[in-house]
């Protein structure tokens, strides 16, 4: 459906408020260092221009593509060269290369100050003084720190953010009302960002086919009563939405996502019985709800897959006629029968099936060759089951903090070249799998755990890609999307690593640790633990535990002392000496 003016089309479809918000998100995700005021100015200019195009679609420049319009606007930023360096070279390119260039310069770990939450009264005053600016600032700060955040979903977060302030700034105890809501939004936001980052990595690094396979498996688990043709249609539409958002086409993405939600709700009878409540909600809530909806019940009676995918004499004929359709049907049929499997496991099974058919359909007796293909699935299924069982037992025994520490040690020994902040962040998130998934019954543990681990390991992959330091990380990240977790699990201690020189400064602590939150204090201790392992990769669990116990006692003692700083200085020296002796440094 060609429109004379794309910008007018999107402005009319989305409405002014959403249009402005999405353009702000797009600009902040591209130019992550630009001040808020500069972005607001650019957004206002684009909005005014869009309005002229709505009034007259034939007006000058209204026929230009959104990439051209937005790229031209971004390239007017005066400080582009000094702020962004080589990114300024993008402006010398023509579309579509210019947009590709901007995309390549998105920074997953921008050098931006940590967001510090002001006092509640200060926030409420700012909210009341200028609600619009306050909410725009939220969009800007999240978007620039999370350049792949799913834009239509960020609008939903902003709506909840606004609702929290509207309610709580009138409450008797503002802080008690507001702070838990903001904590929840922060945690959900980080999780949402990481999930979307995996979708974009899947599309950008492994291609559309990989993303579509993921979507077939996930939607088939979620909508097991839907026909294969219905699932295929949803997968095609969903792939378009995510391709657009990951490509920076946020207006098209938000518009198409709304169309997809509308289609799903109009056809819920042939999709899922679980959509009724979602479909009664307003647009942003509706789309979010559909994305999170629980799996529908499986049809009452489903046959074994053996008949169609092993025993049929037409297996090779059907495969040869339309390989991806046949494999898609296999994946659909398997996934709808197994909501208890992770998506990545289902994809491994489909890959094994594909490899077997590739080999066997060229053999003298194809049927004899692929007759036992389902037996090859057994080790693939049992590996994550056993791993989850062992790690949930360990989590239940240790609790979250110590479980994170066990993972910190494990991963630092596997890939000691990775930066300490990245190891701490990734291992802490890996450790959260325990409290997130181990509480679930067996049938829900694997999809919860392994698909969550895929999201966390993708964080490691994108952070490592920015400054690659480990061939082992590169190998696990790039060889196979679905085998990333098994690849990292299989890594042993890196015997080639030369231990880091001991630096007493790394283990020098000050009284400021006493005023930190429990979480921040844990991060300090976990940072020290990673550094210890980097100095002494051969250290045993017992040695590391002893040093960490001493460290915890040292912090507790000095935080209770009258002269904290002196205590940290004197006791710190003793602790370093004792630790060196204990570890044989």
């Amino acid at each position: 459906d060609a429109h004379k003016s794309e910008v007018a089309h999107r402005f009319k479809d989305l409405g002014e408020e959403n249009f402005k918000a999405l353009v702000l998100i797009a600009f902040a995700q591209y130019l992550q260092q630009c001040p808020f005021e500069d972005h607001v100015k650019l957004v206002n200019e684009v909005t005014e221009f869009a309005k002229t195009c709505v009034a007259d679609e034939s007006a000058e420049n209204c026929d230009k593509s959104l990439h051209t319009l937005f790229g031209d606007k971004l390239c007017t930023v005066a400080t582009l060269r000094e702020t962004y360096g080589e990114m300024a070279d993008c402006c010398a390119k023509q579309e579509p290369e210019r947009n590709e260039c901007f995309l390549q310069h998105k920074d997953d770990n921008p050098n931006l100050p940590r967001l510090v939450r002001p006092e509640v009264d200060v926030m409420c005053t700012a909210f009341h003084d200028n609600e619009e600016t306050f909410l725009k600032k939220y969009l800007y700060e999240i978007a620039r720190r999370h350049p792949y955040f799913y834009a239509p979903e960020l609008l939903f977060f902003a709506k909840r953010y606004k609702a929290a302030f509207t309610e709580c700034c009138q409450a008797a105890d503002k802080a008690a009302c507001l702070l838990p809501k903001l904590d929840e939004l922060r945690d959900e936001g980080k999780a949402s960002s990481a999930k979307q980052r995996l979708k974009c990595a899947s599309l950008q690094k492994f291609g559309e086919r990989a993303f579509k396979a993921w979507a077939v498996a996930r939607l088939s688990q979620r909508f097991p009563k839907a026909e294969f043709a219905e699932v295929s249609k949803l997968v095609t539409d969903l792939t378009k939405v995510h391709t657009e958002c990951c490509h920076g086409d946020l207006l098209e993405c938000a518009d198409d996502r709304a169309d997809l939600a509308k289609y799903i709700c109009e056809n819920q009878d042939s999709i899922s019985s679980k959509l009724k409540e979602c479909c009664e909600k307003p647009l942003l809530e509706k789309s979010h709800c559909i994305a999170e909806v629980e799996n529908d019940e499986m049809p009452a009676d489903l046959p074994s897959l053996a008949a169609d995918f092993v025993e049929s004499k037409d297996v090779c004929k059907n495969y040869a006629e339309a390989k991806d359709v046949f494999l898609g049907m296999f994946l659909y049929e398997y996934a709808r029968r197994h909501p208890d499997y992770s998506v990545v496991l289902l994809l491994r099974l489909a890959k094994t099936y594909e490899t077997t058919l590739e080999k066997c359909c060229a053999a003298a007796d194809p049927h004899e060759c692929y007759a036992k293909v389902f037996d090859e699935f057994k080790p693939l299924v049992e590996e994550p089951q056993n791993l989850i069982k062992q790690n949930c037992e360990l989590f239940e025994q240790l609790g979250e903090y110590k479980f994170q520490n066990a993972l910190l040690v494990r991963y630092t020994k596997k890939v000691p070249q990775v930066s300490t902040p990245t190891l701490v962040e990734v291992s802490r998130n890996l450790g959260k799998v325990g409290s997130k998934c181990c509480k679930h019954p067996e049938a829900k543990r694997m999809p919860c755990a392994e698909d969550y681990l895929s999201v966390v390991l993708n964080q490691l992959c994108v952070l490592h890609e920015k400054t690659p330091v480990s061939d082992r990380v590169t190998k696990c990240c790039t060889e196979s999307l679905v085998n990333r977790r098994p690849c990292f699990s299989a890594l042993e201690v890196d015997e080639t690593y030369v231990p880091k020189e001991f630096n007493a400064e790394t283990f020098t602590f000050h009284a400021d640790i006493c005023t930190l939150s429990e979480k921040e204090r844990q991060i300090k201790k976990q940072t020290a633990l990673v550094e210890l392992v980097k100095h002494k990769p051969k250290a045993t669990k017992e040695q590391l535990k002893a040093v960490m116990d001493d460290f915890a006692a040292f912090v507790e003692k000095c935080c209770k002392a009258d002269d904290k700083e002196t205590c940290f200085a004197e006791e710190g020296k003793k602790l370093v000496a004792a630790s060196q002796a204990a570890l044989g440094l």
Partner: nanobody, 123 residues
Framework: DVQLVESGGGVVQAGGSLRLSCAAS????????MGWFRQAPGKERERVVS????????YYADSVKGRFTISRDNAENTVYLQMNSLKPEDTALYYC????????????????WGQGTLVQVSS
């Protein structure tokens, strides 16, 4: 606690018949696909037959097709295996198993297992 209790095994002449039963308790029977597996001395456990939750679909190993019949009674929480034209190579310990989710009828899909009942076919 989930329990699967097999019965009906015994010694039989080649060409004879036996009917195995498996009574299930502690689970929502109609939510589980059921299967029979067997293990002969010194051999790996192999799948014999399985049946879908509603009983509408069955899956037989080639070696027993036309001779064995699986059925289930969801009201009685019981699955049956009618074995006809028995052969000496059918001698094995027969296990009943339950699968919450069932795609291929392979052993790894089954969540709960009985202790087994012995079938001996003499020539």
């Amino acid at each position: 606690d989930v329990q699967l209790v097999e019965s009906g095994g015994g010694v039989v002449q080649a060409g004879g018949s036996l009917r195995l039963s498996c009574a299930a308790s502690g689970l929502t029977f109609s939510s589980y696909a059921m299967g029979w597996f067997r293990q002969a001395p010194g051999k790996e456990r192999e799948r014999v037959v399985s049946i879908s939750r509603g009983g509408g679909y069955t899956y037989y190993a080639d070696s027993v097709k036309g001779r064995f019949t699986i059925s289930r009674d969801n009201a009685e929480n019981t699955v049956y295996l009618q074995m006809n034209s028995l052969k000496p190579e059918d001698t094995a310990l027969y296990y009943c198993a339950a699968a919450r989710y069932w795609a291929t009828g392979s052993e790894y899909e089954f969540d709960y297992w009985g202790q087994g009942t012995l079938v001996q076919v003499s020539s």
